[in-house]
Each structure stands twice: as C-alpha cells, then as structure tokens.
Interface confidence: medium
C-alpha cells in the first residue's frame, strides 16, 4: 500500500526546494530576556498572532514581573512590539490571552495589580489587537473571562470572593449577578448555568450545591437542581452528578431541555473517591467514563443513546488515572466514528485500542507492515501498535506530542508509538495512518514534533532533541518521502511549532531560543511553503477514496453508522495547493441496517469478537428499572438499540418495547417543591 518512509533517498527530490524555502523563511529575534512565551492566533485566516513574553523575578516579599506584547499580521513573518498599547503592564500568564469566539477580533488580557487595589484590571481589544482599552474591574477575577459562544459582547467571570459577574458590553461595565458561586458555564442561547453553595463553601458543600440557571443574564433565576456535586455540558446534553438520599454515592442525571426536566442516566453510581468524566460528546451521543472503585487508575467507558439516558458498556479497564487525571482518549477527527484510547491490562501494562464505529467495538491497532515486535511482545511475529498520548507524556516518556488529526486532512492520523504487546518505555517512533487508523506505517524514526499544513498537502516535522536544532523535515506525500531543510545556520533550542489552527495555512513558525553565556534570546523562524506547492490543485490531482473500506467485494463495505462516504482525496504524487478555501468533498450513501448498526441496550453487552448482544449475567431475568423524566419505568428490551447518528434504512431492524408504568421516580432530584424561580432585585 505504501513504501517504508524515506528521507532524501529513493524519493523524487523536489526541484530547487532549498532556494524556494530560503526565500520564504523569515526570522524574528525578540529583544527581551523573558522566561516564557505564549502565542495566540486572533481570528481565522487573519494572519494575526499575539505573542506575550513574561519575565518574572521572585523577590523576598513580592515578585517583580515584566511583560512584552508583540503582534504579527502576516502569519508570524514579522512582529511589532506593541507593549506600549498595554501601558507596559505586567500581564498575568495564568489567565492567558482570552481570544473571542469565531472572527470577533476580541482579545482580553488580565493585568497584575498591586495588593491593595479594589479590583483587577484588563486590557480589551475588539479590532484584532490593533488597539487596547484599559478597564479597571470592580472585582478580582478568579478565572479567565468567558465569552458567550453566541454573543462575544457577553462575558462572565468568577471573582476571588466567589461572585458571578456578567458584562453585556465586552467588559466595559460589570454587574455581580450572584454570590457564593462555585462553577459557572455558558450554555446555548446565552444561558448561564452555575452552582451555588448554601452553607459554607464550595468544598464543604460538595454534594449539597444547588444548580441554577439564568436565561436573561441575571435578571431572573431558576433553581434546576439540588444536592449537586458537579455539572457539565456536552453536545446538547446537560449533566449533573447528584448525591443519593441514602448514602454518599452519587448518580448522573441528564437533561436535554436546559434543566427543565431531568432523567436518571442508566450508569453505575459512584462513591466519594470515584468520578465521572465526559470523554466526548456531540449532538447525537456522549462517551462517559465511570471510574472503578478504589484507586485503580481505570474505569469503564459507556456510550449513550440519543437521549443521553440509556448507556451501554463500550470498553472495560479504560485507563484514566485519578492521580494526574490522565486519559489517552483521543477523537480521531480525520475520520467519522474513530476514537483511540488506552486500557490497563491485568498485568498493569497499557495497551492501545481503537474503535471505528463510535464505541460499538474496540480492537487493537494493526501492526505496521515491515515492523518488528519489541521486548514487550511474547510472540515476536504477532503484536500490535500502541499509541503514546497524555498518559505517556505525564509519565515523562520521550513523547513530545499527542496524536494529531485534522478534519480537513481526511484519513490522516499521526502519533508516537511502539510495536509490541503493550506501550513500551523505549524511545518511540512516529507512525502515520492515511485511512483513519485501519493501517499504519512508520513515518519517522525517533520522537518528533509534527504538524499538518494545507489540509494534509504538507506534513512538517522537527526532531525532538535536547541539543540545538536547525533542520525542519517536510513531506508532500502524506509522510512517505521526506526532505530536510536547514532553516538557519545558527541552531536554536527548539520550544515549539506553531501553525494556524485548522491546518489550512502553508506557514509554519519554529520557536526557540539561543543561549549565550548570560542571555537567552527568543527567536522565531516562519517558513512559508507556498512556493513548494506552486500550483493550485485541479480535478485530476484528486482521487476517490471510500472511507472505512475493509472488504471491497462486500456490498456493505465502508458502511459505518448506517452510511458510507466517498471522499475526493489528493493523490500522494500530486504536489499542489489545496488552498485556504479547500472544502472536503464527500458523497454519502445510506446502507441497509444490520446488527452493526445497533448498540447493546442497557443490561446487555457484546462479547469480544461477537456481533450479538448478550445479557449481562448479573442482570439476567431481572426487570430493568430506569428513571425517565422523573418517572420510574420498566424497560423490556431485546438487547439492541440503534446507534445515535446511525442513518441506516431497511434491512435488519430489531424493535424495542418500552412499557411505561408511570410510577414515582426513585430519584427526588427534581422534587417540584424544591423548585423555585426568582427575580434578581
């Protein structure tokens, strides 16, 4: 399918690429001695980058700090020092740069203020950081300003005294709308959800918090939940974990109408030391992790139905450490339905698993062709690929980056990995899949930083080394052949690659510093690949590709979640620009239904390598109790339910019966007597 990756050998070298890149390499040296640098892109396709450098000297009583702010409007090729626009103020890096949603052009920087001041200070810009306005706040912010996703003029913030503050005019004026607030989040339609403590403090009242909602920015409120431990939003679902009446356990409740009605999720309850975590959520469904009792470092992934209520077991022994809160769960955004994560096996080793059907079935990642099994493998001929993600990074393996995929670079997944029976502590290599994780090939030897440009037309990589570097590698054929380019004669200590989010740009910025005897100087090199991809791609440069294709002879080949998709993909041999306006061209077609289109209903599970759902032994013969919209019901089922988002039609369709007994629900989470609405007077 593809040859082994090569670097400058057996590969057609691109003509004059060194001259073309040299003419398009721009150096910027930052004239300060800062210890840290943070970078933010402002807007989409604007070319505007803000760079904040900070230098802090901890003195005996106070710490002296200095910030510098730089702005580029050409994707990082040139920067202008605009520190004067923020009155040379020291900016608090823990709040970062709050960039407004979409292309609003809004930026908020939070300044450090002296101890005795009445409130904090921010610098606000609504013109892509061309100008800033200084605003003194009537409170000290505890969190970064949060923009409403629907209206970037609406902001909320929590104060250090747990007040909930709202601005309706992009931070010019602020109003405290509620006190004793623990957590606040924007919901849809400018709704604010927040928890309040009733007695003492957020920590002391955990499990006795109230969940409130305001739909009019604090004029009126409604209590939508009591005995709350915490809450979260995912897709169109609002989740709350609620303390049980009888003991110290808690359960997840779900609402799809912003908290007006709630249903008890069919998930195990958890004790004090356990946790729930929303791993991923979209408009159709949610992946929920439920921690195992005890400090095991693993739990179970459940996938929801389209109401977020009935859950089926998706993956056992899912690695999610309580200590560092690390999970390897990764949404492969370059192919629908694909997720990769890690499990903790019985011998305490860690193995990678992949699902191609949104959690319906998990399997090991296929061993890359021509690869050898490492020391972790019992059988030197049979093993699989294991992907390094957050947990490996937290355990200080030589893994500079998590897996990478981009929605507009169809099928491409890049990750560090090892080939064996489990994740190895050996120096990892970089692997690439061009079909969304079905097959893999070694892309680069040893650890690298990598990024995708021009919707997959170019992949760029830099070797991870503790020595100064001056070479960037790039590939125009999805990682098969690599060219090396020396971007500077003076090697730098590399700190990061920066390219515009969305992988549409053809510019890459290489950040680092040079160090002499006494000084450290920040420097960036921006390389523009536009002359490497000198022409625009045309119709003949693209070829049709059937996603999820594993058996070309089968009429159901490529069917995932009830439909198949054919994409137009750039040929590996074509060296041309997809361009900034490139839109992924795909053609969907509906498939007939089969067992693959159904998840196992509550109380059922699919044994490994089986398509039939079988009853969970502990529930055999029992009626299944569940709570829907505050009523207790009994569910009779043949064990299947359609996967949320599945579009299959006809074919096999196991029906499900739900018998509504309309008894009172065992959860009094939403006891109407506990409900109230009130105005903010």
């Amino acid at each position: 399918r593809r040859g082994a990756p090569a670097e400058d050998q057996d590969c057609g070298r691109l003509p004059d690429f060194i001259a073309k890149l040299t003419n398009n390499t721009h150096q910027h040296v930052f004239d300060d001695l800062s210890g840290s640098v943070s970078l933010s892109w402002v807007g989409d396709s604007t070319g505007v980058i803000l760079v904040l450098t900070t230098f802090q000297v901890p003195l005996v009583i106070v710490s002296f700090g200095q910030s510098k702010l730089y702005r580029s409007e050409d994707y990082g090729k040139n920067f202008k020092d605009i520190t004067n626009l923020i009155n040379n103020t020291f900016i608090r890096t823990e709040f970062g740069m709050a960039i407004g949603p979409e292309n609003s052009g809004k930026v908020i920087l939070t300044a450090e203020v002296s101890g005795g001041s009445r409130g904090g200070r921010v610098f606000r810009s609504s013109d892509f950081a061309k100008n800033f306005v200084q605003t003194d706040l009537p409170f000290h912010p505890l969190t970064q300003m949060m923009y409403s996703p629907q209206n970037s003029d609406y902001l909320l913030a929590l104060s250090t005294e747990n007040g909930l503050w709202v601005s309706k005019n992009f931070g010019e004026k602020w109003e405290e709308i509620h006190k004793a607030v623990c957590l606040a989040k924007w919901g849809p339609n400018n709704i604010i959800f927040f928890t309040t403590h009733v007695n003492g403090s957020c920590k002391a009242d955990l499990g006795a918090l109230e969940l409130w909602r305001t739909s009019d920015l604090g004029k009126t409120f409604k209590t939508i939940g009591v005995k709350i431990y915490s809450f979260g939003l995912g897709g169109r679902f609002l989740f709350a974990s609620v303390m049980a009446d009888k003991d110290t356990t808690r359960r997840i409740h779900v609402s799809t109408d912003q908290g007006d009605t709630w249903s008890m999720a069919q998930l195990p309850s958890v004790g004090q030391e356990q946790f729930y975590s929303i791993l991923a959520a979209n408009e159709d469904m949610v992946f929920m992790h439920v921690d195992e009792p005890g400090d095991t470092g693993f739990g179970t992934i459940f996938t929801s139905d389209d109401r977020g209520i009935v859950y089926s077991k998706s993956l056992d022994r899912h690695l999610y450490t309580t200590t560092g809160g690390e999970t390897d769960f990764t949404n492969v955004t370059s192919l629908r339905g694909v997720y990769i994560t890690s499990t903790l096996s019985e011998d305490n080793s860690i193995q990678s698993m992949i699902t191609f059907d949104q959690g319906g079935r998990w399997e090991h990642l296929r061993k890359p062709e021509n690869s050898k099994c490492d020391a972790t493998a019992k059988n030197k001929n049979e093993c699989s690929l294991h992907i390094h993600a957050s947990y490996s990074i937290s355990q200080k393996l030589n893994v500079p980056m998590a897996p990478l995929s981009e929605p507009n670079a169809v099928g491409i997944v890049i990750a560090h990995g090892s080939v064996g029976d489990a994740i190895s502590v050996m120096v990892p290599d970089v692997y690439i899949s061009d079909d969304g994780g079905y097959s893999w090939a070694k892309m680069l030897e040893g650890p690298h930083y990598y990024t995708i440009l021009d919707s997959g037309g170019i992949i760029v990589a830099i070797e991870h080394s503790n020595r100064p570097i001056n070479v960037i590698k790039f590939s125009t054929d999805e990682g098969q052949c690599w060219q090396s380019y020396v971007f500077t004669q003076e090697p730098i200590y590399f700190t990061g690659l920066a390219s515009e989010p969305g992988a549409r740009s053809m510019n890459i910025s290489i950040w680092g510093f040079t160090e002499s005897f006494i000084t450290r100087q920040w420097v960036s090199y921006t390389v523009d690949f536009k002359d490497i991809l000198e022409r625009n791609c045309e119709e003949d440069d693209y070829t049709t590709w059937l996603a999820h294709s594993t058996d070309p002879g089968d009429y159901k080949d490529g069917c995932i979640l009830g439909y198949k998709e054919q994409f137009l993909r750039l040929r590996k041999s074509s060296v041309c620009q997809n361009g900034r306006d490139y839109v992924v061209a795909k053609q969907p077609s509906v498939c007939p239904c089969s067992l693959e289109d159904f998840l196992c209903d509550f109380g059922y599970f699919r044994p490994e390598n089986a398509s039939e759902c079988v009853e969970q032994p502990e529930l055999k013969g029992h009626e299944l109790e569940f709570c829907l919209y505050g009523k207790e019901e009994h569910l009779t089922t043949n064990g299947y339910r359609k996967i949320p988002g599945d579009k299959c039609q006809g074919g096999m369709n196991p029906a499900r019966e739900v018998k509504d007994l309309k008894k009172k629900c065992t959860s009094n989470f939403l006891n109407p007597t506990k409900q109230n609405s009130k105005s903010n007077s």
């Epitope: 400090d295 095991t296 305490n348 860690i350 020391a375 972790t376 200080k396 190895s424």
Partner: antibody, heavy 122, light 107 residues
Framework: QVQLVQSGAEVKKPGASVKVSCKAS????????MHWVRQAPGQGLEWMGW????????NYAQKFQGRVTMTRDTSISTAYMELSRLRSDDTAVYYC???????????????WGQGTLVTVSS | DIQMTQSPSTLSASVGDRVTITCRAS??????LAWYQQKPGKAPKLLIY???SLESGVPSRFSGSGSGTEFTLTISSLQPDDFATYYC?????????FGGGTKVEIK
Amino acid sequence: QVQLVQSGAEVKKPGASVKVSCKASGYTFTGYYMHWVRQAPGQGLEWMGWINPNSGGTNYAQKFQGRVTMTRDTSISTAYMELSRLRSDDTAVYYCARGGPQLRVAEYFQHWGQGTLVTVSS
Amino acid sequence: DIQMTQSPSTLSASVGDRVTITCRASQSISSWLAWYQQKPGKAPKLLIYKASSLESGVPSRFSGSGSGTEFTLTISSLQPDDFATYYCQQYKSYPITFGGGTKVEIK
C-alpha cells in the same frame, strides 16, 4: 544476562550529599525504567522513585521530593541517585532495581543491584 | 498511600513444615502483589508476581494466593535454603509500598 552493578559503600556527614551509581548490562538500558529502593539497617524496604533512562523523566516518592535527584548517562548505561541534606536516618542500603519494558502504572522488580551501603554519621 | 501489613513479623519453623505468611493491603489492590525473599547482606529476590504467578527459576514449593486486600505466600515444605525474610509489595499504584517483612527462622 541482566546485571546491575552498584558503586561502593559511602560514609557521609549529616548535611552532605551522596551519589550512588548503578551500571546496567545485558539489556537495552533505555528500554526499562530504573527504580531505587532503600533499606535501613534491620528495617523493611522503601521505594524512592524511578527514572526513565530514555527521556530522563523521573517520579519520586513524596517523602524524598526535594532531596532526591535521579539522573542517567545513556552512553555508559548508568543510572544515578543523589540524596542531599543527609540525616542520620538516611543510613541504609540503597538498591537500584529494573522495571519491565512496558509502560505500567506501577511495577514489580525482577532484577536488583547488589546494594550500596550509605552511612551518615558525624 | 496504600499500607501493606505483613503477619507474623517472625515465624519459627522446621525443615519440612508448611509455612504460610499473610499480607494485608489497606485498600483493594486487585492481584497486583509481588513476594520477595531476602537473605542477610543480599538484595531481594522476586518469587511471585501478580499474586500467584511463579517467577521462572523459583521452586514450585512457593505459591501465592489471594486478591483484593488479603494475600498469602505458602511454602509447602520448608527447605534449609528458605530461612530468610519475606516481603510483599503492591504495584497497583504509586507510591509502591512494601510490607514490613516476615522473618522465617529455624525453630
């Protein structure tokens, strides 16, 4: 065969530092975590932490945080454990022990060094 | 941290005896337990891992059992070479912790 050979016994004064070495042979040094375990005279075993020889990453037990530094030199397949601000109750035999090739949440030890006695006395 | 408690701390036995040592964890550690033998002036030697799996080269008279919080090391017929101190170790999570040890001495 796998061998872990440690440096010789040391006598140190309170407040000083000690650096113990552990030379590995018979396997790929960078492919396995190296742990350090100590044992005070007549006492049980106490885990101190690990180093990942591949990346230099470390994980120390809370008790030793701030006093212990684990390093390695991959060119000579040697791991080091340095303990600073020594006290008399740091008198112990210090062992290096090899973990498995897998990334694990925690592990057991198949191979141990012979131990290095560190005596802290004024 | 997970505490590991071994009992007894000392055990007197004769050659040929069946010897049982117990190890208790302060919370469930599933089967993530190892047993070591240590002789004076020597490094510990791995006997059992994963509660009951015998390390290669270890005589079959050694066996381990248990899961959760209660574990046992059994020597079916004590041999002269077995007089030593035995330690259990949990490897369910960091920090790794050991039991206080059980000294098996000649009666």
